[in-house]
Amino acid sequence: EVEKTACPSGKKAREIDESLIFYKKWELEACVDAALLATQMDRVNAIPFTYEQLDVLKHKLDELYPQGYPESVIQHLGYLFLKMSPEDIRKWNVTSLETLKALLEVNKGHEMSPQVATLIDRFVKGRGQLDKDTLDTLTAFYPGYLCSLSPEELSSVPPSSIWAVRPQDLDTCDPRQLDVLYPKARLAFQNMNGSEYFVKIQSFLGGAPTEDLKALSQQNVSMDLATFMKLRTDAVLPLTVAEVQKLLGPHVEGLKAEERHRPVRDWILRQRQDDLDTLGLGLQGGIPNGYLVLDLSMQEALS
């Protein structure tokens, strides 16, 4: 906090310019008009102030706008954005994507800070949904952004926005999130032909149900093992050996290396050993020949 002192004669700032770096903190406080500062915030971003000087400028803006900064000021905050608390940011009403981009640029290369998380939350809530342009912007700055959202938040993503999603954006998503995103992706890509469709939908398949996997197995997609290992266990279990063979194509040989890991391990336990043997991979653990398999879940449903 800088003491309130009168501005020395001749030092009253008429504009925000480089001469202000020669002002001491108390002089900045006394000689820079907050309203002038607010209208010329863009100039602050071209002047090499010290962090202490910037603290004084922030203090002046806080006094001028106790209810929160207007967007005209927010857009030009630059480094000062990093000095804001989440409480400060919750007072803002940010509607312009250009403002969002300008502030994300300041934090570029760093982890998502509490300030950035709060800013994004305010922005998305203000828009009512995660539209394509917003999602494009956010995933460009933070590839993991999508997977940081709860399933409830993801439900506000319109299918049209899914086109902006890259495979790496989904790397850290868990099954609950993919359960929400997969139907949106299916809808978004529904008019594409077989091979193109598979390329686009592949990253989302961790949310796919059994019937969709069965359908894909009829389309010669040659799913790689990495994708297969991310499928929902409950969606893989009902697949037959023939269906898995068709789904994986030449990658089926990779099952051997994964036979102790889910979902392959659990799937093997559900298959007849005879059927597994037809793959010629030496997979063990299937149901021995002559055993009868009762599906108790089906029996319960019927009763």
Epitope: V44, P48, F49, E105
Partner: nanobody, 115 residues
């Protein structure tokens, strides 16, 4: 973002020193740079500034005519040439920079003693 100052040392009154400011982990080329100094027990004060192109320079009254700020973008370095040094120039000298989107950087300082 970190800036690194060098070139400080002990010099006699009337002597000269050249301080350098370089960037660590990024390039200084599109950064406007300010030189500041802080004497023991005093507030940090601005000494000089230079625009990102080098076309515009400014000086505090106390160093005008004695100090010259320049930059060599090929070497990604900004310099502060200090001539006719006085005992009152004794301080830790810092550089601070501002780049695109208001990104900021500041150094840890280099000590200058005129005695």
């Amino acid at each position: 973002l970190q800036l690194v100052e060098s070139g400080g040392g002990l010099v006699q009154p009337g002597g000269s020193l050249r301080l350098s400011c370089a960037a660590s982990g990024f390039t200084l080329d599109n950064y406007a740079i300010g030189w500041f100094r802080q004497a023991p027990g005093k507030e940090r004060e601005g000494v000089s500034s230079i625009s990102s192109s080098g076309g515009s320079t400014n000086y505090a009254d106390s160093v005008k005519g004695r100090f010259t700020v320049s930059r060599d973008n090929a070497k990604h370095t900004v310099y502060l040439q200090m001539n006719s040094l006085k005992p009152e120039d004794t301080a830790v000298y810092y550089c601070a920079g501002v780049g695109a989107y208001g990104r900021r950087a500041m150094g840890q300082g280099t000590s200058v003693t005129v005695s």
